[in-house]
Each structure stands twice: as structure tokens, then as C-alpha cells.
């Protein structure tokens, strides 16, 4: 009876279990009743990082110097290239696909510490009573407007991203 599931590092095809290709190799042909799975090593600038049945290897990531990137760790047949930024620059994400001089703090966050040559911008969430409605690399959280000092009342509550909205007090007739 043909199998319906295969062991780890195998895959089911044409009602039989074939061995997956090991990391660093791609699939050339599936196994048959009489032959093993045929695999081939990835090329010079290619990789596959898992046991697989891929017919094409992935291209190594290119660390584009025009984006401020350089190679932190050269890729192998089993691993992708790891990029980092030129000295004094910071990756925009964990994948490090581009570089910025310093990060900015999103709305709802204020700048706790402005970037220096060695450290990136440090952001902090705006606490209750404060807001930031902009992305900035220098602006702190701003306090909500005090309606009372303007002889007004709060018409709309503030949030970490918006100021309070003040309005006139209801006058008793």
C-alpha cells in the first residue's frame, strides 16, 4: 500500500517517499522506485538554508553600497549574506535592507535621547498627559494643552498621538 506520510527529511511524490535535498543543494530529479533523489550543490552566489525540494537556489543578498550597506558576513551555500551599515549609520530593520543616519521616533513616541556618533536615537512612549503627532529625531513628547488655564473645557480627550481639544464652557441661562 502506498504511503500517505513520510519520515522527516523526506517528501511524498508519485505515491512514494523521496529524500529531501540537504541545505546547500537543490533538487535535480525526484527519486523513483529504482533511483535516489538527485541533488546538485548551489552555485557560487546562491544558497538554500533548509532541507528542501527546490529546483532553484536563492540568490545571496546584495549589500548595496549606494544604500550605505556593506557585507557583515559572507554567504555560503547554506546561509544568506548578512548586510550591515557603514560606520555611523543604522539599519532600518532587522533584515538591514537600507541605512539611516539615525532613526526617528514615530507618532506616539518622543525623543528621549538625540543620536550621537556612536548611539542611535532613543525613543520613549508618550505618557498620559503628553503626545507626539509627528515622526521626529529631536522632538520630545509635548504636554496636552491645559484647557483650564484658557478658561475652556476639554471637548475631546487627548491621546499619546493627539492633543486635547478645548471648547467654551456651557453657560447656564
Amino acid at each position: 500500500e502506498p504511503p500517505t506520510a513520510c519520515r522527516e527529511k523526506q517528501y511524498l511524490i508519485n505515491s512514494q517517499c523521496c529524500s529531501l535535498c540537504q541545505p546547500g543543494q537543490k533538487l535535480v530529479s525526484d527519486c523513483t522506485e529504482f533511483t535516489e533523489t538527485e541533488c546538485l550543490p548551489c552555485g557560487e552566489s546562491e544558497f538554500l538554508d533548509t532541507w528542501n525540494r527546490e529546483t532553484h537556489c536563492h540568490q545571496h543578498k546584495y549589500c548595496d553600497p549606494n544604500l550605505g550597506l556593506r557585507v557583515q558576513q559572507k554567504g555560503t551555500s547554506e546561509t544568506d549574506t548578512i548586510c550591515t551599515c557603514e560606520e555611523g549609520w543604522h539599519c532600518t530593520s532587522e533584515a538591514c535592507e537600507s541605512c539611516v543616519l539615525h532613526r526617528s521616533c514615530s507618532p506616539g513616541f518622543g525623543v528621549k535621547q538625540i543620536a550621537t556618533g556612536v548611539s542611535d536615537t532613543i525613543c520613549e512612549p508618550c505618557p498620559v498627559g503628553f503626545f507626539s503627532n509627528v515622526s521626529s529625531a529631536f522632538e520630545k513628547c509635548h504636554p496636552w494643552t491645559s484647557c483650564e488655564t484658557k478658561d475652556l473645557v476639554v471637548q475631546q480627550a487627548g491621546t499619546n498621538k493627539t492633543d486635547v481639544v478645548c471648547g467654551p464652557q456651557d453657560r447656564l441661562r
Epitope: 544604500l67 541605512c99 543616519l101 539615525h102 526617528s104
Partner: nanobody, 116 residues
Framework: EVQLLESGGGLVQPGGSLRLSCAAS???????EMWWVRQAPGKGLERVS?????????YYADSVKGRFTISRDNSKNTLYLQMNSLRAEDTAVYYC?????????WGQGTLVTVSS
């Protein structure tokens, strides 16, 4: 394509003044926080000054506070840095940058030399 073209640098004696300009194109200037940064020969980048999109809030590094003034004219898509009481340690290439300060937005800069 974002373009930031700095100008106004030159040789000036200590105690003198210069006004740097940065002509911006390729993006909606009035929507962006802008910065001046500088790089002295053989040194790292130093954040000098910043201004919010409306021009109502500013930041100055301690080293230039009271001597430099940042401003912007959103109708002319231009950023300025008025530099007074210049010192030898202000000698550097000055760059203007827009948030979020990506590497490819880097201009050519303008060289300021303070020397007697």
C-alpha cells in the same frame, strides 16, 4: 529623485559669519523635518541643528547653541543655517538632510573653513 544642494560655505576668519543654504527638490519639502550635520576632517558626523516642518521648533547641539540659527522658507523649498561667532572647531563639511536620513539622500555638502 530627492536632491539636496548645499551652498554658502567658504573661508572665514574666527569670529566671522556665514549663511549656508540648502535647496531641496524631488519631495514635498514643507512636510519634512530637516537637519544640518557636519563632518570635520578625520572625524565622525556631528548633528548640528534641526527644524520641524512648520519651522516652529528647533534643536541645536550644545557646541553651536547661541551662535547658529536654523530656519526654513517652505515657499522657496530652502533650508538655512546662519552661523555667527565662528570658531576654528566649526571647520567641517556641512550637509543638510531630510527625515528619515537615508544614505541615498546624502548631498555633496559645503565646506566651511574657519582660519586666520
Amino acid at each position: 529623485e530627492v536632491q539636496l544642494l548645499e551652498s554658502g560655505g567658504g573661508l572665514v576668519q574666527p569670529g566671522g559669519s556665514l549663511r549656508l543654504s540648502c535647496a531641496a527638490s524631488g519631495f514635498t519639502f514643507r512636510d519634512y523635518e530637516m537637519w544640518w550635520v557636519r563632518q570635520a576632517p578625520g572625524k565622525g558626523l556631528e548633528r548640528v541643528s534641526a527644524i520641524n516642518p512648520q519651522g516652529t521648533r528647533t534643536y541645536y547641539a550644545d557646541s553651536v547653541k547661541g551662535r547658529f540659527t536654523i530656519s526654513r522658507d517652505n515657499s522657496k523649498n530652502t533650508l538655512y543655517l546662519q552661523m555667527n561667532s565662528l570658531r576654528a572647531e566649526d571647520t567641517a563639511v556641512y550637509y543638510c538632510l531630510k527625515l528619515p536620513f537615508t544614505f541615498e539622500d546624502w548631498g555633496q555638502g559645503t565646506l566651511v573653513t574657519v582660519s586666520s
